[in-house]
């Protein structure tokens, strides 16, 4: 806290300008009117205040707006935003996407801080929906944002928002999230030709069902092993040896290195050993020749 002292003669600030950088902390406190600061917040960002000076300015705003800053002030906080705590931010009512963008710009290039997370959560919760413009803004600043959303929230994401998603943006998505995103991606990219389509859809295939993998196996896509290992186990199990061979193309040799890991391990256990032998990779663990294979899931469905 800065002690209350009288402003020295002739030092009363008439406007927010560069002369204030020469003021001591106590002089800023005594000589800058909080209401003036609030109306000229847009100027603060252009002036190279020290962190200590910014603390004083924040303190003045806190005194002026104990219940939380109005949006007209929030929009022009600039680097002063970095001084805000999540407790400060939860007093705000940010409704404009422009305000959100202005604040995200200040934090650009950094990890999502607790302050930014609070700001975003409050903004989205206040709107009651994650509309396309908001989502596009958030994924532009934080590409991994999509994978921080619940499957429930993702269900309201429009397919058009999928266009800008890059493979690395989906690195942290779990299977439940990909289950929701995959059909949207399929819809978004449906008018692309075969090879272009595969490039775009590849990162979403962790949510693909068996029938779509079977269809891809007919299109010479040459799926890499990293993508194959991220496929849903339940979607891979029904694929035949011939289908997996077509799906992976030249990458099929990589199955040997992954034979002890899911989904390859589980898939091997479901194949006839003589079918696996046709690959010439030495994969072991298939159903021995002469054994009868009962499809229990089909049996359950019939009963």
């Amino acid at each position: 806290e800065v002690e209350k002292t009288a402003c020295p003669s002739g030092k009363k600030a008439r406007e927010i300008d560069e002369s204030l950088i020469f003021y001591k902390k106590w002089e800023l406190e005594a000589c800058v009117d909080a209401a003036l600061l609030a109306t000229q917040m847009d100027r603060v960002n252009a002036i190279p205040f020290t962190y200590e000076q910014l603390d004083v300015l924040k303190h003045k705003l806190d005194e002026l707006y104990p219940q939380g800053y109005p949006e007209s002030v929030i929009q022009h906080l600039g680097y002063l935003f970095l001084k805000m705590s999540p407790e400060d931010i939860r007093k705000w009512n940010v409704t404009s996407l422009e305000t959100l963008k202005a604040l995200l710009e200040v934090n650009k290039g950094h990890e999502m801080s607790p302050q930014v997370a609070t700001l975003i959560d409050r903004f989205v919760k206040g709107r009651g929906q994650l509309d396309k413009d908001t989502l596009d803004t958030l994924t532009a600043f934080y590409p991994g944002y999509l994978c921080s959303l619940s499957p429930e929230e993702l269900s309201s994401v429009p397919p058009s928002s999928i266009w800008a998603v890059r493979p690395q943006d989906l690195d942290t998505c779990d299977p439940r999230q990909l289950d929701v995103l995959y059909p949207k991606a399929r819809l978004a990219f449906q008018n692309m030709n075969g090879s272009e389509y595969f490039v775009k859809i590849q990162s979403f295939l962790g949510g693909a069902p068996t029938e779509d993998l079977k269809a891809l196996s007919q299109q010479n896509v040459s799926m890499d092993l990293a993508t194959f290992m991220k496929l849903r186990t339940d979607a891979v199990l029904p694929l035949t040896v011939a289908e997996v061979q077509k799906l992976l193309g030249p990458h099929v040799e990589g199955l040997k290195a992954e034979e002890r890991h899911r989904p390859v391990r589980d898939w091997i256990l479901r194949q006839r050993q003589d079918d696996l032998d046709t690959l010439g990779l030495g994969l072991q663990g298939g159903i021995p020749n002469g054994y009868l294979v009962l499809d229990l899931s089909m049996q359950e469905a019939l009963s």
Epitope: V124, G128, Q129, S148, S150, P151, E152, S155
Partner: antibody, heavy 116, light 107 residues
């Protein structure tokens, strides 16, 4: 301020259908949010039943799926719960609530008893 | 379905004390967890959402924490109005499920 108010019968006979209305004031149910039905059993256990979203899509608790429906009347800013084939196990206080990350506005609840 | 295990089921504490309630989920829900307080004969009231963000008007003596499968709600310096039943609820995917509740009573 958003306000929600449940209405409907306080007593329903077994095997009949329960119909409840949630009237919303202070916010349009088509502008945003998820609009939910939740019930609280006599032992205080809470159960989420269903929601209808601002865009009209809905979702049900699988434990109730074959006997529950949720619809809305946007002109009256109301949404409705219908629960078929009720039993004494459906005796509870029924709440409607608005949500996004949490149920931040609730109705005061309506007590429903299923008894012959 | 994701199961919610809340503990303790009940606890008694004195005004001024600090208490912690925990909630464990059967699957990873990231930070999609809410905490509610309910007084006898009243509707539940949202206290915390997204695991740690306090709802408007909730006193700062309430603190939510955790992510993944382990969460907690801490109440510092208990006030008389804090006594009641507390519930956690996940919002990761439907069906949204609630914890069994923690009844906080005055010692």
């Amino acid at each position: 301020d958003v306000q929600l108010q449940e209405s409907g019968p306080g007593l329903v006979k077994p095997s009949q259908s329960l119909s409840l209305t949630c009237s919303v004031t202070g916010y349009s149910i088509t502008s945003g949010y998820y609009w939910n039905w939740i019930r609280q059993f006599p032992g205080n256990k809470l159960e989420w039943m269903a929601y209808i979203r601002y865009d009209g899509s809905n979702n049900y608790n699988p434990s109730l799926k074959n006997r529950i429906s949720i619809i809305r009347d946007t002109s009256k800013n109301q949404f409705f719960l219908r629960l078929n084939s009720v039993t004494t196990e459906d005796t509870a206080t029924y709440y409607c609530a608005k949500s996004y990350y949490g149920m931040d506005d609730w109705g005061q609840g309506i007590s429903v008893t299923v008894s012959s | 379905d994701i199961q919610m295990t809340q503990s303790p089921a009940s606890l008694s504490a004195s005004v001024g004390e600090t208490v912690t309630i925990t909630c464990r989920t059967s699957g990873d829900i990231h930070n999609y967890l809410a905490w509610y307080q309910q007084k006898q004969g009243k509707s539940p009231q949202l206290l915390v959402y997204k695991a740690k963000t306090l709802e408007n008007g909730v006193p700062s003596r309430f603190t939510g924490s955790g992510s993944g499968t382990q969460f907690s709600l801490k109440i510092d310096s208990l006030q008389p109005e804090d006594f009641g039943t507390y519930y956690c609820q996940h919002f990761w995917t439907t069906p949204y499920t609630f914890g069994g509740g923690t009844k906080l009573e005055i010692k």
